[in-house]
Amino acid sequence: IPTEIPTSALVKETLALLSTHRTLLIANETLRIPVPVHKNHQLCTEEIFQGIGTLESQTVQGGTVERLFKNLSLIKKYIDGQKKKCGEERRRVNQFLDYLQEFLGVMNTEWIIES
Amino acid sequence: IPTEIPTSALVKETLALLSTHRTLLIANETLRIPVPVHKNHQLCTEEIFQGIGTLESQTVQGGTVERLFKNLSLIKKYIDGQKKKCGEERRRVNQFLDYLQEFLGVMNTEWIIES
């Protein structure tokens, strides 16, 4: 029996839980959380999870809302693992250049760039 | 007259310069640079630009190869600016949840997730 839910399934389930518990989560009218002003989400993972921490500390726990925050903590763990893999493999310059080219190509086509 | 080239044009020009100077850049046979092992590039911007710094310090400067590294430094400046914008605006919880939902939605559909 797999002890871990695959990350892709975890994300789907978390989206559903987020929707389910939205009313409970927005109950605190005065709470203010930093929200990134652009859509390049991966650049902002640190701030997003800080915001989740703030929200968790202000939310009455119990039932499936706990499952929501547990899931978000597992997603953070996955992203932290991905960040660790950013510098794991030392490669020849040609391979670094191919990665750089791909990065710039994606930036060129997929990033939301405001001049 | 605009003093700055728009970031999107800068990225395109940099891709072209990268291609032009590839042979010069790969001349160092023994240099090894960390290469991320996944395609979620935005998580790895720090390591990518560290690699660029390593490469620049090992590359004979002059001519348009200098322009390449100048461009890359401007792209880094743009990304650093984007990172600053991750925590600039404090918003109500419902707005944070909208952003979080969008983040998870993008993760669900666009990220390359390996279990």
Partner: antibody
Amino acid sequence: QVQLQESGPGLVKPSQTLSLTCTVSGGSISNGGYYWSWIRQHPGKGLEWIGYIYYSGSTYYNPSLKSRVTISVDTSKNQFSLKLSSVTAADTAVYYCASLGNWFDYWGQGTLVTVSS
Amino acid sequence: SYVLTQPPSVSVAPGQTARITCGGNNIGSKAVYWYQQKPGQAPVLVVHDDSDRPSGIPERFSGSNSGNTATLTISRVEVGDEADYSCQVWDSSSDHVVFGGGTKLTVLG
């Protein structure tokens, strides 16, 4: 542990196109630290590099085979493929797929392809 | 394009030292990789970056590289070392991989 497995016909007729696929397991073909390569070995001879591909689709080919070779990658299936056109008896060889970091780390077991009518 | 030259064969008695060379123009400025291949099997890396051994490869295998010649040295040769040995470099002017022609190591006796 990354494992690679070649598949494709063992017999190809002269002038036709040789097509092989390599399936990668135990690791992602989208791993930025690897190129995915094809190498061949004629009977009783040394290793001959055919070409390699990056997950982004960038390809590099042996100049002596470049006009006949196409390597492609399918990240959704975790596979990469080799096509060698206009084959002759001189293309009879054991064909290996391999992962290429700074060196060839992991190899398939190889598949013998014979070109004969 | 870059060319690597290896002797077709080297013979050595068990317990002796075998030296297999790989010649190339200014090869000393390149990183050299050595592979061992036994009949019917895929090659296995025995030395990388001129002289580094991957885990699991005996200390008897060592490498050196300077000038126009790289050398794979196998000390205290054993019968099980009988195999083909190929050197490999990258041709950085073209991003291409280059193999030597291979050397058959025969262990006498």
